[in-house]
């Protein structure tokens, strides 16, 4: 009869499974675990050895010992090139006696399961059946390397035949190639290259822009110093055995330079002292990018010209430039650098700042009490405001009220070509604290000093004007 | 790839002495490394090896007088117990020929180095 | 443990002959069967594995056979850089266990 299964393929060693015979026998059960039988060899008497040894009990007659169960010897090196096909097997002659015997099949310690080619075959006779167990590989590849074994389990016992090597031989197989770099100008440099048989040896020969580097093939690994190049190259390397000849993937060893400059500089947002700007990153010449440097020259024929430097890191490619005059206009370039240096600047753009806030307070507030309207009247003096801060829009009154632990900060905006202001009277025996502040399209600026007026109970009369006094009149 | 042993010299019987077995180019997670000696005039005598999962095996006359062990990724070291004269010789490290991570294999030996001399004696 | 034993242990043969060398393993190891070359000085260098397997770099006129027990290495047309000792080495195994062994060794001279 034939079977043909899904063969499996070699677990790891087997506790007493000491072959000495080249044949594998089975070892019997024991409370302790395997017990090796002290027997002859069938092959070489008188020549003690332990094995996993099946030492069938009786025959049907109930009188005579069997022979040990052992795998027939076979070749055990197979040596074959890649794509080839192979068959292998095993064989053994079991008595009669022995009933449901299974024959797997295994591979450096893993049971080879699925659908590999195996097939077993059976012949009995009349107190024996030759058991030949086949495996077969189409088009064998170096996974297909290996140790495999045939185990055949008989009566819960466990014969295990000697390993047959498998030596699928090929073109080298790289193990290590050559890697892509960029170096700096004049240095010298290594590169890796290692592949592997069998057959070995492998032999490296190196390649630079399509021409042999050494005349002589290096033994694998081979390291190629390179001691220094003034342009780019390609190298690649040849690994040589005596089934022929593999070439690793090319690589481009580039030479470091300074970077490209950048460009395609914008601007994303202004305001009156800072200036939000973005740009692209140019070729990094081989290198990455250190850092970079946004330079700042105001456009005014007055300014002395003087360029304003502002280091940044590389990434993100944006910076916001700060400490700006406002209402002004500048030229912004951006320059990045490497290991080797510094690209030239980008482009210049054109970039302006907004108006800003007034940098100084109103002058000389003043403020009194007219009782007979119930309010409190307020003049002050127009900031002298630079051009950078805009055109004044207004003014902004706080006026805070204080009495018997209460407080209230209300605010009025008033008109540019007011100095005067009139706001009612919001708590009697009360303190009044006004402040004023000057307004312009960029902002509220600083508000003047305090000044604090008491608003007395109904009745009560005092013409007497709180006041701030101008720069130089204290 | 090469191998290189160092450590021989001139030791008193019973002096303990660790050989080493230098590889490069040879990752031991992949390949056997084995031991062989030769006495002066003689021939070459099978100590142990050490497969690439780390498992010793070594011949009988060997057991218990020397120890294989791997050290780093790029040493292996053979230690002789108890010397006595009759281990002067010249030791070699060899490699087995077929990578793969297993215990067993078929390692007879591809790569050796040029050996290292052990001199025992009073 | 195997036990290799080669014969002989010396011969001699003119430039231009035939050696043969024999090697017998004290139980079968199948086809596990090296032929090292050693030159004074230096260490052994492998010709033939698998039994009758040519190394790299080996000349042809280096022949392996045998399996089993019984091995023989056939060296033809003889050179003087044949002259050296010559090893041959079981390398089988198990899956329990490795069985390395080293034959006493046949020393060619070439005159």
């Known amino acids: 009869r034939e079977e043909a299964k899904p063969y499996p393929l070699f677990p790891g060693p087997l506790p007493g499974s000491l072959q000495t015979d080249h044949t594998s026998l089975l070892s019997l059960p024991h409370t302790s675990g395997y017990q090796p039988a002290l027997m002859f060899s069938p092959t070489q008497p008188g020549r003690p050895y332990t094995g996993n040894v099946a030492i069938p009990r009786v025959t049907s007659a109930g009188s005579k010992l069997l022979p040990p169960l052992a795998f027939k010897h076979t070749v055990g090196h197979i040596i074959l090139s890649e794509h080839k096909d192979v068959k292998f097997n095993c064989s053994i002659s079991v008595p009669n006696i022995y009933q449901d015997t299974t024959i797997s099949w295994w591979k450096d310690g893993k049971e080879l399961l699925g659908a590999h080619h195996a097939i077993t075959q059976f012949y009995p006779d009349d107190e024996v059946t030759a058991i030949i167990a086949s495996f077969s590989i189409t088009s064998v590849q170096r996974s297909d390397n290996g140790s495999y074994i045939c185990k055949m389990k008989i009566n819960n016992e466990e014969i295990v035949s000697d390993p047959i090597y498998i030596e699928v031989q090929g073109l080298p197989h790289f193990t290590k190639q050559p890697e892509s770099m960029n170096v700096t100008r004049n240095t010298a440099f290594n590169l890796t290259c290692q592949a592997v048989g069998p057959p070995e040896p492998v032999n490296i020969f190196w390649v630079q822009n399509s021409s042999r580097v050494n005349e002589q093939p290096e033994k694998s690994p081979s390291v190629l110093t390179v001691p220094g190049l003034t342009e780019m190259a390609v190298f690649s390397c040849e690994a040589h055995n005596d089934k022929g000849l593999t070439v690793s993937k090319g690589v481009q060893i580039n030479i470091k330079a300074i970077p490209s400059p950048p460009t395609e500089v914008s601007i994303h947002n202004s305001t009156a002292h800072s200036i939000l700007i973005s740009w692209v990153p140019g070729f990094d010449g081989y290198s990455p990018f250190r850092n970079c440097s946004v330079q700042v020259k105001e456009v005014d024929p007055l300014s002395n010209g003087s360029v304003m430097i502002f280091n940044t890191s590389a990434s993100p490619h944006m910076y916001q430039i700060k400490q700006l005059q406002a209402l002004a206009n500048y030229s912004i370039g951006v320059s990045c650098m490497n290991e080797i240096g510094w690209s030239a600047v980008s482009p210049w753009i054109l970039a302006s700042t907004t108006e800003g806030a007034p940098s100084v307070a109103p002058l000389n507030v003043t403020v009194f009490l007219n009782e007979s309207r119930d309010n409190v009247d307020i003049r002050w003096m127009k900031p002298l405001t630079k051009r950078q801060a805009g055109e004044l829009v207004g003014y902004r009154i706080s006026h805070v009220w204080q009495s018997a632990g209460i407080s209230k900060e209300l605010l009025e905006e008033v008109g540019q070509n007011n100095s005067r202001a009139q706001i009612s009277v919001q708590v009697h025996n009360a303190t009044c604290t006004v402040r004023i502040a000057a307004v312009t399209k960029g902002g509220v600026g600083p508000f003047s000093d305090p000044v604090k007026i008491f608003i007395p109970a109904h009745g009560w009369v005092d013409h007497a004007p709180s006041s701030t006094p101008a720069p130089g009149n204290a | 790839q090469s191998l290189e042993e160092s450590g021989g010299r001139l030791v008193t019987p019973g002096t303990p002495l660790t050989l080493t077995c230098t590889v490069s180019?040879?990752?031991?997670?992949?390949?056997?490394l084995g031991w062989v000696r030769q006495a002066p005039g003689k021939g070459l005598e099978y100590i142990g090896i050490?497969?690439?999962?780390?498992?010793t095996y070594y011949a009988t006359w060997a057991k218990g007088r020397f120890t294989i062990s791997k050290t780093s990724s790029t040493t292996v070291d053979l230690k002789i117990t108890g010397p006595t004269t009759e281990d002067t010789a010249t030791y070699f490290c060899?490699?087995?020929?077929?990578?793969?991570?297993?215990?067993?294999?078929?390692?007879?030996?591809?790569?050796w180095g040029p050996g290292t001399l052990v001199t025992i004696s009073l | 443990d195997i036990v290799m034993t080669q014969t002989p242990a010396s011969v001699e043969a003119a430039v231009g002959g035939t050696v043969t060398i024999k090697c017998q393993a004290s139980?079968?190891?199948?086809?596990?069967l090296a032929w090292y070359q050693q030159k004074p000085g230096q260490p052994p260098k492998v010709l033939i594995y698998?039994?009758?397997h040519l190394a790299s770099g080996v000349p042809s006129r280096f022949k392996g056979s045998g399996s089993g027990t019984q091995f023989t290495l056939t060296i033809s047309d003889l050179e003087c850089a044949d002259a050296a000792t010559y090893y041959c080495?079981?390398?089988?195994?198990?899956?329990?266990?490795?069985?390395?062994?080293f034959g006493g060794g046949t020393e060619v001279v070439v005159r």
């Open positions: 060899a490699r087995g020929a077929y990578a793969g991570y297993v215990a067993f294999g078929p390692y007879y030996f591809h790569i």
């Open positions: 180019g040879i990752d031991l997670s992949s390949y056997a």
């Open positions: 050490i497969s690439s999962t780390g498992t």
């Open positions: 139980q079968s190891i199948s086809n596990f």
């Open positions: 698998a039994a009758s």
């Open positions: 080495q079981s390398y089988f195994y198990s899956s329990t266990s490795i069985y390395n062994a």
